[in-house]
Amino acid sequence: ELCDDDPPEIPHATFKAMAYKEGTMLNCECKRGFRRIKSGSLYMLCTGNSSHSSWDNQCQCTSSATRNTTKQVTPQPEEQKERKTTEMQSPMQPVDQASLPGHCREPPPWENEATERIYHFVVGQMVYYQCVQGYRALHRGPAESVCKMTHGKTRWTQPQLICTGEMETSQFPGEEKPQASPEGRPESETSCLVTTTDFQIQTEMAATMETSIFTTEYQ
């Protein structure tokens, strides 16, 4: 089931997923002046079997002015700068398969990709928050949000994070220990579709993953 809404917005914070659950869709959006190739995929889809998940379909953009030039998915350095992302991706890291079963890693950029990625998350997806540069994190609990299904409707849990305007930056899970307090998380948010094991694995992934693409907008 796709999540009906975006993850919550936290003032002066951005979020990212460490891995994407099967069923997640990423729209093939092109930057201004470019369009999807004729009969090109509308989106990439995280799919697979129990042992391997990968992104099906490939996004390709071509110049709106030319008719037959197809752009390959290999990004050029000058185009990377135009994306509103913090690029930290290691070339050694496999981009199609996450180490967590049933999940995909961040898809690699494609040439002339739009500045913002439109993701369609599925129930059980977890995203992690960090304060933007120049803001410091005050934790009341874990700085993550999970898309949950309750009474037939989807909703995101509220991340326990406040970003204050001090010149310090916070880190992602595993890079600092959040100061969780028992009263930090409301009672209604203690039951979670993502199992403890999922959370532990994802947190371990977050700690060990040196790299990831951090995107400013998900829809």
């Epitope: 796709l2 009906d4 809404d5 069923g23 869709m25 729209n27 959006e29 009969s39 995929s41 509308l42 989106y43 889809l45 799919t47 099906d56 379909n57 439109i118 369609h120 829809q219």
Partner: antibody, heavy 117, light 104 residues
């Protein structure tokens, strides 16, 4: 529950245009691609195009490009497919369908368009 | 543009029989979808990602294949399975020409 309700049957003359509507309910309309697929009598299903109502991004089959326009009114949760310069070969049942990613999971009931002089 | 060719076009079968419908793609694809369409009805999803059953689909329906050749199998056919079956490729949104199943 998810429902896609299409407008009623149309009879058009060659050269005219037709606009078919698809009213969506029971889900977040702006977050799913909506496709239009047609089926001429006794023939295969044929993809015409799609729209992502969240940002009005569209994609059209090369066969229909230039003749088909797909739009969406997010305030009314309704998608539209307009086909111009109609000819007799455009006589078909026209379906809207929601894209779940893996497959088209919900379909409208179909709208019969007859092109006849 | 990818072309999907189904065989047979038409098959007349008796209840409880096993039915196999094949779909050949003009170029190698990673996954195939299958839809069922009964007379005067909208299509209904059956199989996705080649071999996964959509929710609510009876277990007698199964899919297999890879590369360019894919198969939809109906084990122990029932009268209600009389319909036209279409293979579908989601990256190009191409459909096969359909296989009509008639129950004897």
């Amino acid at each position: 529950q998810v429902q896609l309700v299409q407008s009623g049957a149309e009879v058009k003359k060659p050269g005219a245009s037709v606009k078919v509507s698809c009213k969506a309910s029971g889900y977040s309309f702006t977050r799913y691609w909506m496709h239009w697929v047609r089926q001429p009598p006794g023939q295969r299903l044929e993809w015409m195009g799609a729209i992502y109502p969240g940002n009005s991004d569209t994609s059209y089959s090369q066969k229909f490009e230039g003749r088909v326009t797909i739009t969406a009114d997010t305030s009314a949760s309704t998608a539209y497919m307009e086909l111009s310069s109609l000819r007799s070969e455009d006589t078909a049942v026209y379906y809207c369908s929601r894209d779940y990613g893996y497959y088209f999971d919900f379909w409208g009931q179909g709208t019969t368009v007859t092109v006849s002089s | 543009e990818i072309v999907l060719t189904q065989s047979p076009d038409f098959q007349s079968v008796t209840p409880k029989e096993k039915v196999t419908i094949t779909c050949r793609a003009s170029s190698s694809r990673s996954y195939m979808q299958w839809y069922q369409q009964k007379p005067d009805q909208s299509p209904k999803r059956l199989i996705y990602d080649t071999s996964k059953s959509a929710s609510g689909v009876p277990s007698r329906f199964s899919g297999s294949g890879s590369g360019t050749d894919y198969t939809l199998t109906i084990n122990s056919l029932e009268a209600e399975d009389a319909a036209t079956y279409y293979c579908h490729q989601r990256s190009s949104y191409t459909f096969g020409q359909g296989t009509k199943l008639e129950i004897k």
